[in-house]
């Protein structure tokens, strides 16, 4: 018998009624009589509606489902789901019995818009050019997690510091929480992009900062506008420069390197000499190029902690700074893959790809492959770990049913050293056994 | 040498349906995918789908979806694109192209000469 | 879906200039391909995996990268550079082009 269900999951919103289709083709002379419909959970098996011995046997589900009696007789064994629920996303299965008997699974996929993003600000007052703010943009009750995008007000993105957070309510909705932390410019534009995937729907927010122009130094400071890229254990240096007057001496220079966030002293050269290194130990000036105006910072054996911005503060008579950005990055290792189970392998197994890779910074994007090219995106999961140095180890696992032979290929990519290392693994023939026996 | 020649120029009325052939020469044809690219008058390259000759697995674009078909026929190393339903918007240059290289280096490497399809009533 | 936009859509340039033609995609991609299409002619590989040159192809093509921009770089323009170069990914389905950038000679 054959059953019929759409082959695309049914997308309904959370609170609506949804209709899960599912048709058979009954032949001359068919009676209700002769029908057994049940719809259960795919995966639990769980008995969700039923129509047997001729009758509606009712919802064993919640009582928020029903059949479509009055088209049953004409092969519509559809059932409706009242009041979506997120936890009624999931596979379920139409099982149609006459004298033989047929099945299929239609997926229902869940989604609720996102509410349009409130935006906060903080500090909020007193703003001057050079600050750094943190801006927090919120949008609620929506489902399935959503993806954040941040844009500046001539739409580039803003990618740099973000942090998101989406936390699901008892009903499962979530809401999300997107924090951006950023340098004022003179003024500027920040909106925040809130997409459901599901829905394609976009929800945005957007805040215009305008700050008070600071008191300008007449000493002006230069830093370099890219984040400086240093590699985990290495040496960094950020550059920082002014331009002394004739007839300037060190004896009126103060130099003060801080941390821009917390002002944590890093290094200073005050009252004609070098004070030292207030940060651990790793920290030189040029000394012998300061009389120059190079005020450039030595940062010794990098670690992942030391990534963000550097304040480089001159005093002469007048006072400038200016802040750099170091950007920390670590290179991640060539892919070990692994293949479970991995012995005696058929055409049709469902199998389990394990690509990891170790050590790098920052997190990594991995892609998977085919043999011919194409991107494998069905069943992936990625998860890194960052250990004690802060530095992240990736696991990425593809489940994938085997073809005759295929080459499944993982990418492991460094977004900040655009450096990528890749693994694959090529199942060949069957049966067979990974790795290969000698 | 690697090459991949397509049908000629077809005209077509609404409602109708057009096939479109590509045959390869030079190279394994069950090795690497043939994807279908099109280019209306004067705008850009539209991917239509591909079809893998050796397990005949075919992907399309949403767009196409239902209304595009992909097949191969190993035994003359021929692809082949029918689209129906043929409306004007679908007046165009049809393209097949090789998708070759080695993981994870992939591009269209070889082109057809293209196929005009002209749909007018 | 990943949309790539190229910018820009045109540029009339002299030879022995530097040219840029960027191209952005909405999320981030494995690799980005390039191609070179000529008035009546078929598209020709150009660029492929984001900087390699496609056999042929001259040494003042280049190809930078930073976040999602792909920037494809001509260092002294030449007059048989004349064409629209479209970018191209496929890290997830659907596979997608930008929507060209034509480039024309003084």
């Known amino acids: 018998l054959e059953v019929q269900v759409p082959e695309d999951p049914v997308v309904a919103l959370v609170g609506t009624d949804a209709t899960l289709r599912c048709s058979f083709s009954p032949e001359p002379g068919f009676s209700l009589a002769q029908l057994n419909l049940i719809w259960q959970l795919t995966d639990t098996k769980q008995l969700v509606h039923s129509f047997t011995e001729g009758r509606d046997q009712g919802s064993a589900y919640a009582n928020r489902t029903a059949l479509f009696l009055d088209l049953l007789a004409q092969g519509n064994a559809s059932l409706r789901l009242q009041r979506v629920r997120v936890a009624d996303e999931g596979s379920f299965t139409c099982f149609v019995s006459i004298r033989d008997f047929g099945s299929a699974a239609v997926s229902l996929q869940v989604a609720a818009p996102y509410s349009k993003p409130s935006m906060t600000l903080e500090p909020n007052k007193d703003l001057r050019p050079g600050d750094t703010v943190t801006i927090t943009c919120s949008s609620y009750r929506g489902y399935p997690e959503a993806e954040v995008f941040w844009q500046d007000g001539q739409g580039a993105p803003l990618t740099g510091n973000v942090t998101t957070s989406q936390m699901a309510n008892e009903q499962g909705l979530f809401d999300v929480h997107s924090v951006l932390r950023v340098v004022l410019g003179a003024n500027g534009t920040y909106s925040c992009l809130v997409r459901n995937p599901v829905l394609q729907q976009d929800a945005h927010g957007s805040i215009t900062i305008t700050p008070q122009r600071s008191p300008t130094g007449a000493v002006e400071v230069q830093v370099p506008e890219d984040p400086v890229v240093a590699l985990v254990g290495t040496d960094a240096t950020l550059r920082c420069s002014f331009s002394p007057e004739p007839g300037f001496s060190l004896a009126q220079l103060n130099l003060i390197w801080q941390l821009t966030d917390t002002k944590q002293l890093v290094h200073s050269f005050t009252e004609g000499r070098d004070q030292g290194s207030a940060y651990a130990n790793r920290t030189a000036l040029f000394l012998d190029l300061l009389a120059q105006g190079n005020a450039s910072l030595r940062l010794q054996r990098v670690r992942v902690a030391d990534e963000g911005s550097f304040t480089c503060f001159v005093s002469i008579r007048d006072f400038g700074s200016a802040a750099v950005s170091l950007q920390v990055a670590a290179p991640y290792s060539k892919p070990s893959m692994t293949l479970e189970p991995n012995k005696d392998l058929r055409p049709g197994d469902t199998v389990t790809i394990t690509c990891s890779s170790y050590r790098g910074y920052p997190e990594a994007e991995v892609f998977w492959q085919d043999g011919q090219g194409a991107p494998l995106t069905g069943n992936v999961t990625t998860s890194q770990m960052a250990n004690e140095q802060g530095l992240f180890d990736v696991h990425s696992v593809l489940r994938v049913v085997l073809g005759a032979n295929g080459t499944y290929s993982c990418l492991v990519r460094n977004p900040v050293l655009q450096q990528d290392a890749h693994g694959s693994v090529t199942i060949t023939g069957q049966p067979m056994t990974f790795p290969p026996e000698a | 040498e690697v090459q991949l020649v397509q049908s000629g120029a077809e005209v077509k009325k609404p409602g109708s349906s057009v096939k479109v052939s590509c045959k390869a020469s030079g190279y394994s044809f069950t090795s690497y995918t043939i994807h279908w690219v099109r280019q209306a008058p004067g705008q850009g390259l539209e991917w239509m789908g591909y079809i893998n000759p050796n397990s005949r697995n075919t992907d399309y674009a949403q767009k196409f979806q239902g209304r595009v078909t992909l097949t191969a026929d190993k035994s003359t190393s021929t692809a082949y694109m029918e689209l129906s339903s043929l409306r004007s918007e679908d007046t165009a240059v049809y393209y097949c192209?090789?998708?070759?290289?080695?993981?994870?280096?992939?591009?269209?490497?070889?082109w057809g000469q293209g196929t005009t399809v002209t749909v007018s009533s | 879906e990943i949309v790539l936009t190229q910018s820009p859509d045109f540029q009339s340039v002299t030879p022995k200039e530097k040219v840029t033609i960027t191209c952005r995609a909405s999320s981030s991609v494995s690799y980005m391909n390039w191609y070179q299409q000529k008035p009546d002619q078929s598209p020709k590989p150009w660029i492929y995996?984001?900087?390699n040159l496609a056999s042929g192809v001259p040494s003042r093509f280049s190809v930078s990268v930073s976040g999602t921009d792909h920037t494809l770089t001509i260092n002294s323009l030449e007059a048989e550079d004349a064409a629209t170069y479209y970018c191209?990914?496929?890290?997830?389905?659907?596979?997608?082009f930008g929507q060209g950038t034509k480039l024309e000679i003084k």
């Open positions: 192209a090789r998708y070759s290289g080695s993981t994870p280096y992939w591009y269209f490497d070889v």
């Open positions: 995996a984001t900087s």
């Open positions: 191209q990914q496929w890290s997830s389905n659907p596979l997608t």
